[in-house]
């Protein structure tokens, strides 16, 4: 399980691998703060609501973010 409430940062382990944008329920980008010194990306999957922590430094994840924002901009009027 990548999530924990016992540490300042939410993510314990992070993945460099992208997920299918169509499988995403929600994608949260949590900026670095006084509580956690790094940006965290938390993907909530449609299937079972499983949460995954993604590495914001990974090129594959950056490509995923681009794809998601492109999809969103298509949907917005």
């Amino acid at each position: 399980v990548p999530l924990s409430r016992t540490v300042r940062c939410t993510c314990i382990s992070i993945s460099n691998q992208p997920v299918n944008p169509r499988s995403l329920e929600k994608l949260e980008i949590i900026p670095a703060s006084q509580f956690c010194p790094r940006v965290e990306i938390i993907a909530t999957m449609k299937k079972k609501g499983e949460k995954r922590c993604l590495n914001p430094e990974s090129k594959a994840i950056k490509n995923l973010l681009k794809a998601v924002s492109k999809e969103r901009s298509k949907r917005s009027p």
């Epitope: 992208p18 090129k59 490509n63």
Partner: antibody, heavy 119, light 107 residues
Framework: QIQLVQSGPELKKPGETVKISCKAS????????MHWVKQAPGKGLKWMGW????????TYADDFKGRFAFSLETSASTAYLQINNLKNEDTATYFC????????????WGAGTTVTVSS | DIQMTQSPSSLSASLGGKVTITCKAS??????IAWYQHKPGKGPRLLIH???TLQPGIPSRFSGSGSGRDYSFSISNLEPEDIATYYC?????????FGSGTKLEIK
Amino acid sequence: QIQLVQSGPELKKPGETVKISCKASGYTFTDYSMHWVKQAPGKGLKWMGWINTETGEPTYADDFKGRFAFSLETSASTAYLQINNLKNEDTATYFCARNYDYDGYFDVWGAGTTVTVSS
Amino acid sequence: DIQMTQSPSSLSASLGGKVTITCKASQDINKYIAWYQHKPGKGPRLLIHYTSTLQPGIPSRFSGSGSGRDYSFSISNLEPEDIATYYCLQYDNLLFTFGSGTKLEIK
């Protein structure tokens, strides 16, 4: 050393199913996504999609939705490509390729599996 | 999808000579281009990534350059083992696309 070893050539009839394998060694299988690439005879390389090796979730390029299925046997560090209801136009060499996701490109390739579809 | 237009489709050059292959993307790919050498019966071999970064073990006879939409790949001091087909790949996108390939022959 890091390598991807693919299964041998296949000769199939139209309508049949083929399942080809790609066995990884020399690295942690679940650390990198696995992609599949098609090369039809006399043609160039065409990306088919990928499978997330941590979750087993496949993603298919638009031209490969429907009859194509990516799967894993994580305990054996093996990825599979299955093609159902084979057509003549599926005759090709299929490559598996590891993606170095952190930087985004394919850094290790299998030698390819030739699938021939002929009645 | 991003299209990659690769040229020429084939070329012939002399041993010791130099060849250049170009790839033009249909939009800015931010230098995220890789170059591969492909020989029959083998998997493609990564030569260069991020436009100009040589993979470990690849001789400095191979080089790449470019930015925006326009990229080039060169081989100098051609050797017999360079006979192969070369492909560019853009990876600035979740949907990967290859160039159509350039078949290199030695005169």
